[in-house]
Interface confidence: medium
């Protein structure tokens, strides 16, 4: 029974075998399922842990120690229990074949037996000795892991919270990245795509010259409209001529008509009589210049001055100086009226700003500016605003003081970068600032985490794209 | 009511081609990115294609295993959105969706494409 | 390109119960991910999106939740209209990619 020997079977077991004799007495002594082994994934983001990594590493392996020293146990009681049956059968043995003569070996036997018991007493006392010794060292280990726990806790908070620092300064940058990365590929496709393309450029002028034709009729139909109500107006003055008696206080039928049909602004097409919506013929003050604007004489009282529109992405804002100048897109649609209108119009008299915006899940907010003008193009457009009310944020999405304008080829803004290039679309940029309603036009459900979309910080956060949007301008006496 | 309705499914010999209809109503299908979804018989959903409008042009994207064998277009006086199959592989075969913007909240019924000798 | 992996591939389930169906992105897809509920011959319909936005008239026991790489559809009490194959998506970037599906199963 001393040739004993220790092994691994098939399944992972430790395995103990005892030779006695002609028999043979193998001990399979089980492994606790809890315990993972050190080859065995484990993957955690450290920063959302309760405790360090070397924490949870030390309670792993003081789990594998007690597993070890649970086995351990389990394997001595079993030795001990084995080696008292093997004494009983022994001593059964003597007794049963020993006669008077076989005394002294007997006693040999008995002696080896106790020699042999004492040996494994021995070493069970050494075994438990290095148990309790290593338990021992552990319980200091992990006690001295708990005491530093806190210390590490806390330093994972900080740097949880630098953490959360960093990645609002990358979220920008990553939303950067992707947009690269998006015309990255669309850069790849180019080639393959160039005959696709082509075809896609045929059909899209063809859709273009089909809105085109429909486009000229609604013109001609308004037209149509435009010259009857002119062709009334003209017979209402001539009628107003005829019945003044005095003929000093008569005047060039010619001049009266130009009088009535040239407006400034849609306040005062409304305050003319025209309280339809639609498009209007404006005229710049102090000039003969001329500029087509929609109206809207239903909301809020009328007389609104639309001066941008956005609702479909139809048209692109990623334009230059001169034609944020002048002005681009279809009045009937997406539109900017132009800023040299615009600054005219609003230096000559007082003007409040009205901005309309709509969400994709059907909301509308807006924010009214009591005061607004342009400034110059000698001073970039830069614009004014004071006293902010509505419904989109009580601070205003437009940086105060006002910025001057930028454009693709016109950066005017407070970046080291050009907003205008990285945001797409001219505005008046801060650094890059809190709105941008000339962005990129977004759809439904592809509308979020856009940072180069229609923007306006304060009522739906930075990386919110707009469903539609109008800027409307009107006399603040209206 | 939005509706999406697909047609123009059949079965075509292996190098054949086909081209795909979607006619669309309910909803600014100017302003929709619109998409070609398919899913083979028993298997998941695996997308094919996009057409989006970037302010006032149309841009495409195609899933790698299409890429220069199919087109997306489409004719905006028509409502409608085509997927032109060329050069037809028999791993092709499978029902083809229509649906907006994605993630897509609006999607057609399905036309079955068979590719087989 | 991102993949998208699903788990489980199936699961069984009684009416009543909770169920929650994972999926990870291989990258970071910010919060652009979808869930679709796909039943036998029929289209797709769209339940999630932003990863934890109800489309609307889906009912309140779908909720959706997860950003960056980690994502997950919970049906809080399964209904028997629920038996369905249900599929995650991310719309972040080229090429959209789906997960492999799930399909719930009557115990």
């Known amino acids: 029974y001393n040739n004993f020997r220790k092994s691994m079977d098939s399944i992972g077991k430790k395995q103990y075998q005892v030779q006695h004799g002609s028999c043979s007495y193998t001990f399979l002594l089980p492994e606790m399922d809890n315990c993972r082994s050190s080859s065995s994934p484990y993957v955690s983001n450290a920063v959302q842990r309760d405790a360090p990594l070397e924490y949870d590493d030390s309670v792993q392996r003081l789990q594998v120690l007690e597993n070890i020293m649970e086995n351990n146990t389990q394997w001595l009681m079993k030795l001990e229990n084995y080696i008292q049956d093997n004494m009983k059968k022994e001593m059964v043995e003597i007794q049963q074949n020993a006669v008077q003569n076989q005394t002294a070996v007997m006693i040999e036997i008995g002696t080896n037996l106790l020699n042999q018991t004492a040996e494994q007493t021995r070493k069970l006392t050494d075994v438990e000795a290095q148990v309790l010794n290593q338990t021992t060292r552990l319980e200091l280990q992990l006690l001295e892991h708990s005491l530093s726990t806190n210390k590490l806790e806390k330093q994972i908070l900080d740097q949880t919270s630098e953490i959360n620092k960093l990645q609002d300064k990358n979220s920008f940058l990553e939303k950067k990245v992707l947009a690269m990365e998006d015309k990255h590929i669309i850069q790849l496709q180019s080639i393959k795509e160039e005959k696709d393309q082509l075809q896609v450029l045929v059909s899209k002028q063809n859709s273009i010259i089909e809105e085109l034709e429909k486009k000229i009729v609604t013109a001609t139909v308004n037209n149509s409209v435009l010259q009857k109500q002119q062709h009334d107006l003209m017979e209402t003055v001539n009628n107003l001529l005829t019945m003044m008696s005095t003929s000093n206080s008569a005047k060039d039928p010619t001049v009266a008509k130009e009088e009535q049909i040239s407006f400034r602004d849609c306040a005062e097409v409304f305050k003319s009589g025209h309280t339809t919506n639609g498009i209007y013929t404006l005229t710049f003050p102090n000039s003969t210049e001329e500029i087509k604007a929609y109206c809207d004489m239903e909301a809020g009282g009328g007389g609104w001055t639309i001066i941008q529109r956005r609702e479909d992405g139809s048209v692109d804002f990623q334009r230059t100086w001169k034609e944020y100048k002048v002005g681009f897109g279809n009045p009937s649609g997406e539109y900017w009226l132009g800023n040299e209108f615009v600054s005219q119009l609003t230096n000559q008299q007082r003007y409040v700003l009205k901005i309309h915006l709509k969400d994709w899940e059907g909301n509308e907010a807006y924010s009214l500016y009591e005061h607004f003008y342009l400034s110059s193009e000698e001073l970039n457009y830069r614009i004014h605003l004071k006293g902010l009310t509505g419904t989109a944020g009580k601070i205003s999405s437009i940086s105060q003081p006002g910025n001057d304008f930028s454009t693709k080829d016109g950066d005017n803004d407070k970046c080291i970068c050009k907003c205008s290039q990285m945001l797409t679309g001219g505005w008046w940029f801060d650094a890059c600032g809190p709105s941008n309603l000339n962005g990129m036009y977004y759809p439904q459900r592809q509308n979020t985490n856009k940072f180069n979309g229609i923007k306006w910080y304060y009522w739906k956060g930075s990386g919110y794209s707009l469903k539609a949007t109008t800027m409307m301008i009107r006399p603040a006496d209206f | 009511e939005v509706q999406l309705v697909e047609s123009g499914g059949g079965l075509v010999k292996p190098g054949g081609s086909l081209r795909l209809s979607c006619a669309a109503s309910g909803f600014t299908f100017r302003a929709a990115w619109m998409n070609w979804v398919r899913q083979a018989p028993g298997k998941g959903l695996e997308w094919v294609a996009e057409i989006r409008l970037k302010s006032n042009h149309y841009e495409t994207h195609y899933a790698e295993s299409v890429k220069g064998r199919f087109t997306i277009s489409r004719d905006v006086s028509k409502n409608t959105v085509y997927l032109q199959m060329n050069s037809l592989k028999t791993e092709d075969t499978a029902v083809y969706y229509c649906?907006?913007?994605?993630?897509?909240?609006?999607w057609g019924q399905g036309t079955l494409v068979t590719v087989s000798s | 390109d991102i993949q998208m992996t699903q788990s489980p591939s199936s699961l069984s389930a009684s009416v009543g119960d909770r169920v929650t169906i994972t999926c990870k992105a291989s990258q970071y897809v910010f919060t652009d991910v979808a869930w679709y509920q796909q039943k036998p011959g029929k289209a797709p319909k769209l339940l999630i999106y932003?990863?934890?936005t109800r489309w609307t008239g889906v009912p309140s026991r779908f909720s959706g939740s997860g950003s960056g790489t980690d994502f997950t559809l919970t049906i809080s009490s399964l209904q028997p209209e629920d038996f369905a194959t249900y599929y995650c998506?991310?719309?972040?970037?080229?090429?959209?990619?789906f997960g492999g599906g799930t399909k719930v199963e009557i115990k």
């Open positions: 649906t907006d913007t994605q993630p897509g909240a609006y």
């Open positions: 932003w990863a934890s």
């Open positions: 998506q991310q719309t972040s970037s080229y090429p959209l990619t």
